[in-house]
């Protein structure tokens, strides 16, 4: 039978082994944790001529001087942007991005590596990599960036037309979108026979103005003009009653890669406009 001393001895040995194992595990996790950090991006779209955001977040580091952010783009041999030791390091920046990029320097410390891209060009489309190095380790994530033009449509009653007509206009789209009319009353109806859509090239020879006219409009109905390309989908609604006209517009960026659809409602203002006294709608 084992003596009390032996039991104590083996108990202590067991405790030491368990503790050593636990410490080894902790150290192991600590070391492996320093090798890889989580970096997250969201696929997005840029509107030509405007400023865009390439979204990227990472596990923050307590020391700004230990954080390195590098943005790369497929097919581009210089860096899109580099931020290190608390400031921009642009000696390796590619010519095509010169003077057009910035990180949110005050937000880097909290894990925001998003890139602001000024004056978005059609050629900015492509695959980007957000590459992060911190004292914890390194990580990266790719981002698909689409570029085009998209704008809010406005639907108005066409007072100049000879018949009961609605006019849907959107100033800037690219690539050429499809335009579909729909109505609340005649759901599922095909309005292609009673509508006419034209695309007018804008002065910069890339984007186009979209104009679509819908004929044979009836009163007390809500009509929707839906403009869509592979980047965005915009809808302009108009409700015409005997006493007023209500309008609503909505633009949604189509973002198949992201788990959450980037959807923004602009100009959700209902404009109350008196009907023209001479406009007689059926």
């Amino acid at each position: 039978m084992a003596s009390l001393g032996q039991i104590l001895f083996w108990s202590i040995i067991s405790i030491i082994i368990i503790l050593a194992g636990a410490i080894a595990l902790i150290i192991g996790f600590g070391i492996s944790g320093r090798h890889s950090i989580t970096v997250t991006t969201v696929a997005s779209a840029g509107n030509i001529g405007e400023d865009g955001i390439l979204s990227c977040t990472f596990e923050p580091d307590i020391k700004l001087s230990d954080i390195v952010i590098q943005w790369l783009k497929e097919g581009v041999l210089g860096l899109v942007h580099e931020f290190k030791e608390g400031k921009d390091e642009l000696s390796e920046q590619d010519e095509m991005f010169r003077g057009r990029t910035a990180v949110f320097a005050d937000q880097v410390i909290v894990g925001n590596a998003s890139l602001r891209l000024k004056n978005v060009q059609l050629t900015d489309a492509g695959t980007y990599k957000c590459y992060i190095i911190t004292s914890k380790g390194k990580g990266n994530a790719n981002l698909e960036y689409k570029t085009g033009a998209f704008s809010m449509p406005e639907v108005n009653v066409d007072y100049n037309a000879s018949s009961e007509t609605l006019r849907c206009e959107a100033p800037r789209w690219f690539p050429q979108p499809t335009v579909v009319w729909a109505s609340q009353v005649d759901q599922g109806a095909n309005f292609s026979e009673v509508s006419n859509t034209s695309f007018e090239l804008n002065s910069e020879n890339v984007t186009m103005k979209v104009v679509s006219v819908l004929y044979n409009v009836t009163i007390n109905n809500t009509y929707s003009c839906m403009i869509e390309n592979d980047i965005a989908k915009a809808t302009g609604d108009i409700k015409v009653t005997e006493s007023e006209i209500k309008r609503r517009s909505h633009l949604q960026l189509l973002n198949s890669k992201a788990s959450l659809c980037v959807s923004s409602f602009f100009a959700i203002s209902w404009a109350l406009l008196p009907l023209s006294p001479y406009l007689m709608l059926k």
Partner: antibody, heavy 121, light 107 residues
């Protein structure tokens, strides 16, 4: 299958010209930057020239600057290297290679089989 | 220009040996370092990129490590198919630089 196929090599006299071609297939050629790399007989690899995916930016090793011109025709999925004022030291096997910036950090993941250029009188 | 120096130039080893090739950069590089394998009369083949990432289809006996100026390629257990010349390559400022190569031959 991702493939690069060089052609246009041959024997040329010093001071002469040659145009190498590299036909790409199996990937979206216009997306990627491309390189020419050469290997002199019994020697190591040496980078010659690079072109961006858009074709708007070109880069050269000092040894070929002003003599060689890299270009691409995305409609034909073809990369070119126009070599003028050739010298004996330009004798080498010339490889074209696809540069993967995003996935492989400027590594060259696809190479052609090479075409031999011999500059001799 | 950044110079890349490989050592040794030639390495004699046997099947099953653990082999290490070193590559030194003349100045610190971002980790944009790749390793290639080349067999006589063939095109180079990418093995490792970003200093330590294994290219898909490359056997796991190949591994890369290092940062700053010193990098290593390790073959944990040399196989008959591994006798070849190995090159390190760095990228910086629109220029690629290769090491002079390390020939791994049968002892």
């Amino acid at each position: 299958e991702v493939q690069l196929l060089e052609s246009g090599g041959g024997l040329v006299q010093p001071g002469g010209s040659l145009r190498l071609s590299c036909a790409a297939s199996g990937f979206t050629f216009s997306t990627y930057a491309m390189n020419w790399v050469r290997q002199a007989p019994g020697k190591g690899l040496a980078w010659v020239s690079a072109i961006s995916g858009s074709g708007g930016s070109t880069y050269y090793a000092d040894s070929v600057k002003g003599r060689f011109t890299i270009s691409r025709d995305d409609s034909k999925n073809t990369l070119y290297l126009q070599m003028n004022s050739l010298r004996a030291e330009d004798t080498a096997v010339y490889y074209c290679a696809k540069v993967d910036v995003v996935a492989r950090y400027y590594g060259m993941d696809v190479w052609g089989q090479g075409t031999t250029v011999t500059v001799s009188s | 220009d950044i110079q890349m120096t490989q050592s040794p130039s030639t390495l004699s080893a046997s099947v099953g040996d653990r082999v290490t090739i070193t590559c030194r950069a003349s100045q610190s590089i971002s980790g944009w370092l790749a390793w290639y394998q080349q067999k006589p009369g063939k095109a180079p083949k990418l093995l490792i990129y970003e200093a330590s990432s294994l290219e898909s289809g490359v056997p796991s006996r190949f591994s890369g490590s290092g940062s700053g100026t010193e990098f290593t390629l390790t073959i944990s257990s040399l196989q008959p198919d591994d006798f070849a010349t190995y090159y390190c390559q760095q990228y910086k400022s629109y220029s690629w630089t290769f090491g002079q190569g390390t020939k791994v031959e049968i002892k």
